[in-house]
Every structure is written in C-alpha cells, then in structure tokens.
C-alpha cells in the first residue's frame, strides 16, 4: 500500500529457470512405404532451448521437412500459387508466403497442379496445420522452479524468492502454497483462465509475473513474491498478423557428400518473467 | 503531457517478434581448379536464431571457415605474428588475438613465413576483410512483424499495439501508417538516418524504440503506441572496441570418424526493441 | 545525489558483451579399452553461445553422455531407483529424476542390480558429479567487452560507455582504471567476493551492475557509469533446488542410418548485466 | 564433388531419334534437379528440359510432345530420349545439376542434318 513518506525505490531483477518433463510421442511413420508406430522421448535438451532467464520456451508440438537439399523444384501449391504459364512467375521474386526465390518458369508440381519454379531448399516445407491435439501435449505436467533474486540498490536491499527454509518438492498453488516456485505448466494455464491442450496445438506466450511490494522499514518489514499468471499473446489475432508461437529452426547433415538439413517449425509456449514493484523506507 | 494529478505507473512489456523474407546469396566457387557458380538460399532458420522477445538477430555477412579439426598447426600470419626463432613462442600462452594456444615452437607457415605452432582448431581462422558489398544485403527487404503487450498492474490495465482493425498487409509509414507494425528493415535504417547496405557488412544495432504514453482516465482516455528508430552501436568506434556486430558460431560433424566443424562469423543486425512509457489515472 | 528540483528519468539501455579468451582441455579419454590423453581446444564458438545483450555465459566444466540412441533401457541406478519386481515399476510413469517413461518392467542394470526399463534416450545419462576441478577453469582469464548505450528519452540524452578517448588494451581495475569497460573473467569474481575456481565447478550466476546517475544540466553535467558485481545465484542453496547455474543440449547426428545424440550437461557462469539509474534535469 | 558426363550425342537425320545420358558421380542425383541446356552456334544456353525429385519435367516449348527427360536413381544417371529430330535441334547439349552449386558437363553434339 501507499506510504507517502517512504522513499520508493523500483527493483532490480534478475531470474533463473529450469523446466523439468519427459514426453513421449507416438506417431505414424512411413519409410519406404510401409508405416510404423515411432515412439520419440523428448527431455529437456529436446524440447526447450538455452534461452536468456527472463524467458523460457517449451515446444509442444512440430511439423518437420525433413531431407531438404538446396537446388530448384516447383514450390507448393498453396492458395494463390497455382500458374498456368511463365507469365505468372517473375524471375528473381520473392513472395512473402513463398519458400523460394522465383526462376520465371511454370513448371509441372504433381500431375494435376502447376507452380512457379524457385531456387530453394527443396522439397519445399508443405503447409500443414499443426497436429491436433499437440504432439507435446503432456508437457502440461511439466514443472518449471523459478529462481528470482532481487535487489534494491538504494536502498542496500538483496533478496531472492526461496527461503531456506522452503521445501524442494513442493508445488505452487495460490493458496496452499503460494510461496512454493515450482509450477506445474497446467497450472500455471488454468490460474490464467486458459486451457492448456487447446493453446499447444498453434502456442502462444504466457505471462508469470512476479510482484514485490517491499517495506523495508525495520518495525514492519514485509518483502516476499506474490504470483499472478496472464496470457500475452492474442488468442482472437487475424490469421494474417500470426496467430500462436512458432518458429522455425534447423538441423544440418551431409549426407552422400550433399548438405542437407531438417527444417522444424516449432509450436510451444514462450514463457515471459515479468518482475516489477518497489521498495520503500523511510 | 505531464498531468501532476494523475498516479504514474511504468510500463510492464511482452514482446514477440516474426521475421519474413529469403535471401540468394550467389557466389563464385573454385574447386579442384574448376570455378562453379553457387547459389545459396537463406530463410528464416538460416539467417536468423532463436532469439528471446525483445530483440532479434538478422545475418548479413559470413565469412566460414570451412573442415576444421583440433590438431596442431602454425598460427594464421596476422600482423606482429610471425616469428625467426622458437624464442619468440611462448609454451601455453594464449595471444588474445590468436586462435590456440602456443606449443613453444616456430614453425614455416607457408614458403616465405614462419609462426608459431598452435593447439588449435585448425587451420586456424584467416583474418578476412568481411566481404563488400554484405552477401545478404538484400535483407534490406525484410519485414518483420513486431507484436507487443503491454500492462500497467496498478492500473489494473492492460493493451496491445496491434487492434482487431489492422490490416495484415500494411506497411509501417511515419506518416501514412504509423500504427502499422510490420516493418521494413530498410526503412527502419532510412528512419534512423542510416545506409543498410554499409550496416550490412560489418553489423551493427539498431533500437526500435516503442513508447507509450498512456492517459487513462475515461473522460482522455488514450494509449496507442509511437515507433522510433535509433542506431544503438558506435560506428566512429575504433578498431580495438570490435566495431560493428559479429559473432562466431560452429557446426559440428564427423568425417571418417574425425570431429571436424565449420566455423562461422556471422555478421549482422541485432534489432533491439525498447519499450518505455507510462500510464497515468487521476 | 537527490537534487528534489530536477525532473528524474528512468534508463534506456541496451548492452552488447564480447567474450575472448581460449582454454585447453586435458582429459584421459577411453576407447576401446586404451587410455589416452586427450586436449580439446575451446574458443568462443564452442564454450558461449548467441545470447541476448543483457546476459552472455561462459561455460566452465561440462559432462557428456556419447551416442545416445532412442531405445528401451535399464534407467541409471540412482539412490531410490533400483527395484527388484515389476510391482515397483509403474508403466507411462515419469519419474522427475529419472530420463525416460517407465515400460512397467524391473530387468537387470548390471550384475548386481536391477532398475525399472524405461523408453529414453539410452544409454541414460549418468548421474556423475561435475568434474573438480573444473574442466574450463582456465576461463578465469577470459575477458569480456562491455558496450552500454543509454537513452533518457525524456531529455533527449544519449551517451555510451565507451567513450573516444579509451584505449581498448585497458582492463577494469576499481581505483586505476574503473571506467575501462574490458574486465577479466577472474577479477570480476574477486571484486563480488568469490572464488572463480570453486563456482565453476556447478556453474552460478554473476551480477554486473551498471549505475548511471546522470546530471544532465549543462552548469554541473556528469555522466559516467559505476560498475559492481555481485553474486546472483544462492550459494548455499539446498540440493532439491538446484544449486550453481547448468543447463542441457544435445548435437544430433545419424550414424549407419540410426539418429544419435551427445547430450552435453554444460556448467558455467552466467553473467547479467543489470542496468539502472535515472537522469536528472531542471 | 559431383561430376556429370553426358554421351550419346551423334549426327542423326531430321526425323530421327538421340537418347543423351549423363553419368553423375560424387552425390546421388535422387536429391537434386537435373537438367539439360542446349547452346547453338552464336546463341545463348538456353534449357531444354528439366526433372525434379519428385518426378515431374518440364520442357521448353518447341521440344514438348518429342522429347522425354528420365532418372535412373540407381544408375545414378540422367537420360534426355529425343523423338522426331528437327535441324533447330542441332546444338551442343550441356548435362545441368543444381545442388547449392550448378554443376555442368563437357557438353555432347548433337547435328540434325536435312
């Protein structure tokens, strides 16, 4: 509360995260036309990546291109992207929703369809809707510890969330343990009014702030967390400003002296830390 | 404007960031005496990483440094690093410029020059110009989508710069469409009084700046974001500072059983996103 | 100081960090049942990775689990984790410690001992103590440039760090040069009073605090940084929250058509710069 | 790395029929699209015909109906069946791949006599 003869100071932040889960995957795989069961285990080195501490992100679902190689081929034929001749391919173009850089020509893309010709890496990514329900969709079991250590510099002033005298298996829980900085994912949706499942098909961002309201007058000190949990990114955006989270990243191989790569388009949940409050002293 | 009755609170900030665009990097290649022409493509898992929300990295340069191998070899012959004698290598010292660690002896380099011997990856890295003009300067034609959710908690408050109304296919205009929030990175620069295609080949920082100065009291109600730009690293910076913006990064492998990597220096844009403003509320 | 008449305005700051140094690594390797020296040679591309601006890592001290291949396996026998019938294994069970889901099978580890089979990345990695001493500890010489450029928006102020008149062979030292902004990994340490060599065996995290506390009226301008350290992580941390600062990834490879991986546990000191003060005017 | 030779290249009446091969060796052709060029006296390279990974071709105008680019992944070879041959077809035709880099043959001659 307001103590208008204190001297208020803002805080200092600094986080540390550390998510711990195992999932499993099981989905059907066809090579060389037969189709298999795979069963793929996804830890911590899998799904998250040595991200700065104020945020952390967990895949929970992925649509892959695998074996893509550098050369030309007729891009995909999404909507809008059919050709009937050169005309329609301008050579050196680079459309925004395409994957390559256009060769001008039009070339044959199945039996029935025709694209423009790009330079790229090929076959092109298809445009697949993400796997639905999420690949990861376990990972609502997941738990993040969230180390926080704060400092108000003018005022002398050094703490961090976790007492010694906290207990390593706890788990967050707004009122039987709403000092405990472990969190389980699923929780930390359903405190935000969101439902899990849903948002790891497409992801999205969610927010865990961390306010500190510190009296650092020594007869009524008072300076610990309190946690509060809101989804950042827009669940109604238009289809066109990229709805969710996802990225794309790579994995690079040769293979027969070809470089080649895997493209994964990750979904997951990009978590933000946000920390703010003051310090006031007389 | 400053209104003395309202309560001030600072902004809390979530940031996500979409880039957009492929870049053909064509170069001349020689190889077992015969010169090809190589057509490389970069999009977004190329040339951009996984980066947190409140920046973003754009290469624009490379020089790599192609089957390295830890083994021992003579330094690279930058200047003051050539030698006569094993008296001037110093067993297990490490020249912060060099790239190993010396073994004690001078050794030929090539026919005319001696260095001294290296624990190192090797062959050590060449001291190359960056390349001029910037392999990837057509990322001059980049856009990148910035969304951004802010909250003022004591206000109870919370928006975001995009509205259901914004179209999808805008461009950021100073003065035709400033409200728009996908931007080109060539006009970011142009903004910032700045040449991209310079930028482009030794890197550098640029600050896209968000400010919001919020009044929300229903009888003024207004908050709506102001862009600006700025180039955050010094381009007068001497030479002993690392002007500009690089940093090396490797692919590893195996070839016949032998860990090799490709060592790359990535030259590039480091887009920072400032988000700064208040909201105030009688 | 507080001079109560001057309007008072928050930092804009954006940070760059450029890490140089190179350690050697000697470790008896075995393979095929022959002990051999082994010296690895680590420089930035292989010990620090792209981070953002306001944090950058050093890795120090790591452990490997080589060519691991998802399959079924005997989990690792950790304290708790034998069994001795399937009646102690629960199948779709994912043990927080453990690497894998359980199949509900108790079968034999080794001669001696018999742990729950799990579907994991086999062979699961090992619970071995972080090497001591520290395998990087030779990081204590690294140094690190730190560029600060700041922004008081308000009063259309922009300074940095680095100012022309600097020499770039300087390195930080409280009283003889405290406003070169080059610091030695170990004399960072020295200042927050710790010990390099003891922190990056498990790795911790290091504050360096920048403090501008600017005056920015033309009769009694200043403006300089103030630099300090101090440790971030809880050195006396309980077990159960995980003490010192590490993280995992993995480098994927396909050998004889089969897809690996090297998970690496990397330990090492991650260092965040926290920068505040205000700028003041009439 | 990969090195393409064509043969099958002649001196053929109008009306008659060539089948050009291109051996490639150094990385299997499955992975990239080949191609042939033709370069006639005095004129620009211009390309013929060309097969992607997953099978389809294109062809220029004037050769559609009359000529047939395959693969023989296995061979590790690329054919160009040339049916119904016109003078206009005389050139000299260059096997193409493009993997990262354009990897060219020597070039094989095909005449068209009248």
């Known amino acids: 509360s307001d103590k208008l003869y204190q001297r208020k100071e803002p805080v200092i932040s600094s986080v540390h995260t550390k998510v711990k889960g195992i999932a499993e995957v099981t989905e059907n795989v066809t090579e060389g036309g037969v189709t298999k069961l795979g069963h793929s285990i996804f830890d911590t080195a899998d799904y998250t990546f040595p991200l700065q501490g104020n945020s952390f992100f967990v895949m929970t679902n992925y649509v892959k291109s695998e074996g893509q190689v550098q050369t030309l081929c007729p891009e995909y034929p999404r909507r809008g992207a059919q050709c009937s001749s050169d005309r329609r391919c301008k050579k050196g173009w680079m459309d925004p929703q395409s994957k390559g850089i256009q060769t001008g020509r039009c070339v044959p893309y199945d039996k029935t369809r025709k694209t423009c010709e790009v330079s790229a890496w090929c076959p092109t990514e298809e445009e697949k809707e993400a796997p639905r329900p999420a690949l990861l969709r376990s990972a609502e079991n997941f738990t993040v510890l969230i180390k926080n250590n704060i400092h108000f510099p003018g005022h002398n002033y050094t703490t961090r969330n976790i007492l010694p005298t906290m207990n390593g298996s706890c788990t967050f829980h707004k009122t039987w343990d709403p000092q405990c900085s472990i969190f389980r994912l699923g929780d930390i949706f359903q405190e935000a009014g969101e439902n899990f499942t849903e948002v790891a098909v497409q992801g999205g961002i969610m927010g865990i702030e961390i306010y500190w309201d510190c009296n650092l007058d020594s007869w009524s000190h008072h300076c610990r967390p309190r946690y509060s949990f809101r989804r950042l990114d827009d669940k109604n955006m238009d289809e066109s400003f990229v709805p969710g989270y996802n990225f794309r990243y790579a994995k690079y191989y040769k293979e027969n002296n070809v470089e080649k790569r895997t493209l994964i388009k990750a979904f997951g949940i990009r978590f933000d830390i946000l920390v703010f409050g003051t310090g006031g002293k007389f | 404007s400053d209104k003395l009755y309202q309560r001030k609170e600072p902004v809390i900030s979530s940031v996500h960031t979409k880039v957009k665009g492929i870049a053909e990097v064509t170069e001349n290649v020689t190889e077992g005496g015969v010169t090809k022409l190589g057509h490389s493509i970069f999009d977004t898992a190329d040339y951009t990483f996984p980066l947190q929300g409140n920046s973003f990295f754009v290469m624009t340069n490379y020089v790599k440094s192609e089957g390295q191998v830890q083994t021992l070899c003579p330094e690279y012959p930058r200047r003051g690093a050539q030698c006569s004698s094993d008296r001037r290598c110093k067993k297990g010292w490490m020249d912060p410029q060099s790239k190993g660690i010396q073994t004690g002896r001078c050794v030929p380099y090539d026919k005319t020059r001696k260095t001294c011997e290296v624990s190192a990856w090797c062959p050590t890295e060449e001291e190359k110009e960056a390349p001029r003009p910037a392999l990837l300067r057509s990322a001059e034609n980049f856009t990148v989508l910035i969304k951004n959710n802010i909250h003022f908690p004591g206000h109870n408050y919370t928006t975001r710069n995009i509205l259901p109304t914004m179209n999808g296919s805008c461009t950021f205009h100073k003065t035709w469409d400033p409200q728009c929030s996908i931007f080109r990175l060539g006009d970011i620069f142009q903004e910032a009084g700045e040449n991209f295609t310079e930028v482009a080949v030794q890197g550098g920082i640029m600050g896209i700046e968000i400010y919001w100065d919020c009044n929300l009291d229903s009888w003024s109600h207004h908050c709506r974001p102001r862009y600006s730009f700025r180039r955050l690293d010094d381009k007068n910076m001497d030479e002993s500072f690392v002007p500009g913006y690089n940093f090396r990064y490797a692919k590893y492998y195996k070839e016949n059983n032998v860990e090799k990597r490709t060592l790359i220096k990535a030259f590039g844009i480091r887009f920072d996103i400032l988000v700064f403003g208040t909201g105030g509320k009688f | 100081s507080d001079k109560l008449y001057q309007r008072k305005e928050p930092v804009i700051s954006s940070v760059h960090t450029k890490v140089k140094g190179i350690a050697e690594v000697t470790e008896n390797v075995t393979e095929g049942g022959v002990t051999k020296l082994g010296h690895s040679i680590f420089d930035t591309a292989d010990y620090t990775f792209p981070l953002q601006g306001n944090s950058f890592f050093v890795m120090t001290n790591y452990v490997k689990s080589e060519g691991q291949v998802q399959t079924l396996c005997p989990e690792y026998p950790r304290r708790g984790a034998q069994c001795s019938s399937d009646r102690r294994c629960k199948k779709g069970w994912m043990d927080p410690q453990s690497k894998g889901i359980q199949t509900g099978r108790c079968v034999p580890y080794d001669k001696t001992r018999k742990t729950c089979e799990v579907s994991a990345w086999c062979p699961t990695e090992e619970e071995k103590e972080a090497p001591r001493p520290a395998l990087l500890r030779s990081a204590e010489n690294f140094t690190v440039l730190i560029k600060n450029n700041i922004h008081f928006p308000g009063h259309n102020y922009t300074t940095r760090n680095i100012l022309p008149t600097m020499n770039g062979s300087c390195t930080f030292h409280k009283t003889w040069d405290p406003q070169c902004s080059i610091f030695r990994l170990g004399d960072i340490f020295q200042e927050a009073g710790e010990n390099f060599t003891e922190v990056a065996v498990q790795g911790g995290i290091m504050g360096i605090e920048i403090y501008w506390d600017c005056n920015l009226d033309s009769w009694s301008h200043h403006c300089r940084p103030r630099y300090s350290f101090r440790r971030l992580d809880d050195k006396n941390m309980d077990e159960s929250f995980v003490p010192g600062y590490n993280f995992r990834y993995a480098k994927y490879y396909k050998e004889n058509n089969v897809e690996k991986r090297t998970l690496i546990k990397a330990f090492g000191i991650r260092f965040d710069i926290l920068v505040f003060g205000t700028g003041g005017k009439f | 790395k990969v090195q393409l030779v064509e043969s099958g290249g002649g001196l053929v009446q109008a009306g008659g029929s060539l089948r050009l091969s291109c051996a490639a060796s150094?990385?299997?052709?499955?992975?990239?699209?080949m191609g042939w060029y033709r370069q006639a006296p005095g004129k620009p390279r211009e390309l013929v015909a060309r097969?992607?990974?997953?099978?389809?071709?294109w062809y220029e105008d004037s050769v559609k109906g009359r000529f047939t680019i395959s693969r023989d992944n296995a061979q590790n070879t690329v054919y160009l069946q040339m049916n119904s041959l016109k003078s206009e077809d005389t050139a000299v035709y260059y096997c193409?791949?493009?993997?990262?880099?354009?990897?060219w043959g020597q070039g094989t001659q095909v005449t068209v006599s009248s």
């Open positions: 193409h791949g493009r993997v990262r880099y354009d990897y």
């Open positions: 150094g990385s299997p052709i499955s992975s990239y699209a």
């Open positions: 097969i992607y990974t997953g099978g389809t071709a």
